[in-house]
């Protein structure tokens, strides 16, 4: 469960991937297509509002409370429009709805690698928000290797 | 109740080399990093660097990367550190620490070993 | 690396006075500023995350606040038992940061 319903905190702040391209969305034929891309010198970057929540981690659902929180953020690149993982399709996609947000909505926030960000899904743990074939798609992390793998890592730069 | 049990204190030459431990129980070990802090007396917080459970992966303070080594036993859920070439300036109490939250260092630390003294001393 | 300056380094106050420490971090941290208390022989122990939440045991005289850059830890009605060094640590970026510390003592 969510501890309560309003954010710890927000932030505005642009998100490029680790090889520093950057990710911008576009509406095409009245949907947002994501895109991962180099970018122009002279070109804006796009800005998403991260939302941070603050969440039991199902590992501790019986304990006292006080262990096993976890830190959650919901992406959202314009108004009522949220980053959403499909783990049937492995893809990443951008949703207009409503809130509450569904949980498909919501990702458990790692940091450390290299200044970097990783999104875990909250809906499949062990599945992160990663780069394939210059486009957003979720990725089965395999934490007998290092979590630090390139293609999950992004920069969030204001 | 989560715990972190430290190894006890060690009185060492300078030059040589001490492997201290932090033993944790109360929460699935693999879960969290676990980080080293190195307060020398009288003085503040220093964070050393911590490793990742899951993988052995290891990050580390530019400022102690010559001077420690991180390693795990996960069948026992013990961490160990290494301090090698030991000078006067190595005499501190250190502390193992878990963060507040699974995954990130927001939250800051919520748990803490009662640290290991090492007394480097001809 | 975010340096985290911290202010006063020492302070001497009156039980049940208010008290003030400020912890300025050289670049923004958003919320990500944590505070610690420290008793003497002892380890340090979480009052405040996310610059305004208060850990779980902590007495609510203990206030947190800030975001950004500059960050403040104020203890209201000063108890005996809050006779204690006080440091901020910032969580943002690696290497993890911590302030100087301020040493509280009984005027």
């Known amino acids: 469960s969510i501890t309560g319903i309003s954010p710890i905190t927000e932030s505005l702040a642009s998100l490029s991937t680790y090889n520093d391209q950057s990710i911008t969305f576009a509406l095409e034929d009245e949907s947002y297509e994501i895109y991962v891309e180099d970018l122009k010198k002279d070109k804006k970057k796009d800005k998403v509002l991260l939302s941070y929540y603050e969440s039991q981690h199902p590992s501790s659902e019986s304990g006292d409370g006080v262990d096993g929180k976890m830190l959650m953020v919901t992406l959202s690149p314009t108004k009522d429009f949220w980053l959403q993982a499909n783990n049937k399709e492995h893809s990443v996609e951008l949703h207009k709805c409503e809130k509450p947000l569904p949980d498909q909505a919501f990702f458990v926030l790692h940091n450390r690698s290299f200044n970097c960000v990783s999104f875990e899904c909250k809906t499949d743990p062990g599945v992160f928000i990663g780069v394939k074939d210059n486009h957003l798609a979720l990725i089965k992390v395999d934490y007998s290797e290092n979590l630090g793998s390139e293609n999950i890592l992004f920069k969030l730069s204001e | 109740e989560v715990l972190l049990q430290q190894s006890g204190p060690e009185l060492v030459k300078p030059g040589a080399s001490v492997k201290i431990s932090c033993n944790a129980s109360?929460?699935?070990?693999?879960?969290?990093?676990m980080n080293w802090v190195k307060q020398s007396h009288g003085k503040s917080l220093e964070s050393i660097g911590d490793?990742?459970?899951?993988?052995?992966?290891?990050f580390y303070n530019q400022n102690f990367k010559d001077k420690a080594t991180l390693t795990i036993d996960k069948s026992s859920s013990t961490v160990y550190m290494e301090l090698r070439s030991l000078t006067s300036e190595d005499t501190a109490m250190y502390y193992c620490?878990?963060?507040?939250?699974?995954?990130?260092?927001?939250?800051?630390?919520?748990?803490w070993g009662q640290g290991t003294l090492v007394t480097v001393a001809a | 690396d975010i340096q985290m300056n911290q202010s006063p380094s020492s302070l001497s106050a009156s039980l049940g006075d208010t008290i003030t420490i400020t912890c300025h971090a050289s670049?923004?941290?958003?919320?990500?500023l944590s505070w610690y208390q420290q008793k003497a022989g002892n380890n340090p122990k979480l009052l405040i995350y996310?610059?305004?939440k208060l850990h779980t045991g902590v007495p609510s005289r203990f206030t947190g606040s800030g975001s950004g850059t500059l960050f403040t830890l104020t203890i209201s009605s000063l108890q005996p038992e809050d006779i204690a060094t006080y440091y901020c640590?910032?969580?943002?970026?690696?290497?993890?940061?911590f302030g100087s510390g301020t040493n509280l003592e009984l005027k």
């Open positions: 109360g929460y699935t070990f693999s879960d969290y990093n």
């Open positions: 670049q923004n941290i958003n919320v990500w």
């Open positions: 640590q910032q969580g943002q970026s690696y290497p993890l940061t």
């Open positions: 996310a610059a305004s």
């Open positions: 490793i990742n459970p899951k993988n052995g992966d290891t």
């Open positions: 620490a878990r963060h507040y939250y699974y995954g990130s260092s927001y939250g800051g630390f919520v748990y």
